[in-house]
């Protein structure tokens, strides 16, 4: 069964996918498609890499990670409800039936309705509601609800919690393997 990832309408979604290049000069082609991985290739391709670079992409889909080092995680900009569904990351390893296939389920939640802005609400700009880690567990994307009106003590506490949180750290390492 596919791992589930969540994002909110209007935010960027992050779908992790990694592999370890076998040889520095010759990367493994990767395709991303909308829909579960078929027997071959990717259906409804949204992005593709070849032995050196990104050679096909569609609007809003891009690789933000070190894709030449094997981080082929997909970023989808400014998601809408229509972006919900299964996505396929296919590592196209040479040879018959050698491909690594990963199905990832993206769940898009409606944007939260926020009350009329107050001066204290300016604080939320410093802490966007979607905090993304590029870790290796199943919960790479976590969503914070709308922040209520809070006092300065609460702001300080929340800031410290965010600073200390693992959400604030990039857990990805250069030796990541396919998962």
């Amino acid at each position: 069964s596919e791992v589930e990832y969540r994002a909110e309408v209007g935010q960027n979604a992050y779908l992790p996918c990694f592999y370890t290049p076998a040889a520095p000069g010759n990367l493994v082609p990767v395709c991303w498609g909308k829909g579960a991985c078929p027997v071959f290739e990717c259906g409804n391709v949204v992005l593709r890499t070849d032995e050196r670079d990104v050679n096909y992409w569609t609007s809003r889909y891009w690789l933000n990670g070190d894709f030449r080092k094997g981080d082929v995680s997909l970023t989808i900009e400014n998601v809408t409800l229509a972006d919900s569904g299964i996505y396929c990351c296919r590592i196209q390893i040479p040879g018959i039936m050698n491909d690594e296939k990963f199905n990832l389920k993206l769940v898009i939640k409606p944007a939260k309705v926020t009350p009329a802005p107050t001066r204290q609400r300016d604080f939320t700009a410093a802490f966007p509601r979607m905090l993304t880690t590029r870790g290796h567990g199943p919960a790479e994307t976590q969503t914070l609800g709308s922040l209520p009106d809070i006092n300065l003590t609460q702001i300080s506490t929340l800031a410290n919690e965010l600073r200390d949180s693992r959400l604030a750290n990039d857990l990805r390492d250069s030796g990541a393997t396919i998962r």
């Epitope: 520095p24 000069g25 050196r52 670079d53 990104v54 891009w62 070190d66 894709f67």
Partner: antibody, heavy 120, light 107 residues
Framework: QVQLQQSGPELVKPGDSVKMSCKAS????????MDWVKQSHGKSLEWIGY????????SYNQKFKGKATLTVDKSSSTAYMELHSLTSEDSAVYYC?????????????WGQGTTLTVSS | DIVMTQSPDSLAVSLGERVTINCKAS??????VAWYQQKPGQSPKLLIY???NRYTGVPDRFSGSGSGTDFTLTISSLQAEDVAVYYC?????????FGQGTKLEIK
């Protein structure tokens, strides 16, 4: 140390072809891509294409398809670029540059450039 | 093709002053941007790769930052030998494209 030694200046007539070379030394030639870049006089840089000496694989800027042909001779660690059907627009300095995996395929070493003048 | 637009086209700065050169990509290129320095009559030299990594032997007054579409090359304290044209380049997707160049002079 790594060096890319390019062939000397060329003066050719319109319609002719020219083949310039880039001899690599100081590293394993087949482990790195070789890219070619054009710089017209007083202008910016234009990527022409690359070749991967390990397997001869190439990729070209659409603008230079049919204009440039990239080849390598692994035995002499030399990359070549042939330019066809030359016009005055092809007059420029042409650089070979090593595309390094460890620098994310930015160009860590460049040749000194070959100046091509197309004139009747 | 991805268009890389540098600003300014040229600038004159006093020795010891801070220099900032900007580069904007027409679409996101992740961190796949390099900066090169080209002095008159010379080949370009790599300064910064992968947006913020200083290449071997490059003085630490040079630094790069940015990701996505907006990138910056900074020289913290301008030296006389920094007079050159500076180019950004995206190597996210072919055709790899360069900015138009920024000419840096001493005021």
């Amino acid at each position: 140390q790594v060096q890319l030694q390019q062939s000397g200046p060329e003066l050719v007539k319109p319609g002719d072809s020219v083949k310039m070379s880039c001899k690599a030394s100081g590293y394993t030639f087949t482990d790195y891509y070789m890219d070619w870049v054009k710089q017209s006089h007083g202008k910016s840089l234009e990527w022409i294409g690359y070749i991967y000496p390990n397997n001869g694989g190439t990729s070209y800027n659409q603008k230079f398809k049919g204009k440039a042909t990239l080849t390598v001779d692994k035995s002499s660690s030399t990359a070549y670029m042939e330019l066809h059907s030359l016009t005055s627009e092809d007059s420029a300095v042409y650089y070979c540059a090593r595309g390094g995996y460890y620098s994310y395929y930015s160009y860590d070493y460049w040749g000194q450039g070959t100046t091509l003048t197309v004139s009747s | 093709d991805i268009v890389m637009t540098q600003s300014p086209d040229s600038l004159a700065v006093s020795l010891g002053e801070r220099v900032t050169i900007n580069c904007k990509a027409s679409q996101s290129v992740g961190n796949n941007v390099a900066w090169y320095q080209q002095k008159p009559g010379q080949s370009p030299k790599l300064l910064i790769y992968y947006a913020s990594n200083r290449y071997t032997g490059v003085p630490d007054r040079f630094s790069g930052s940015g990701s996505g579409t907006d990138f910056t090359l900074t020289i913290s304290s301008l030296q006389a030998e920094d007079v050159a044209v500076y180019y950004c380049q995206q190597h996210y997707s072919s055709p790899y494209t360069f900015g138009q160049g920024t000419k840096l002079e001493i005021k």
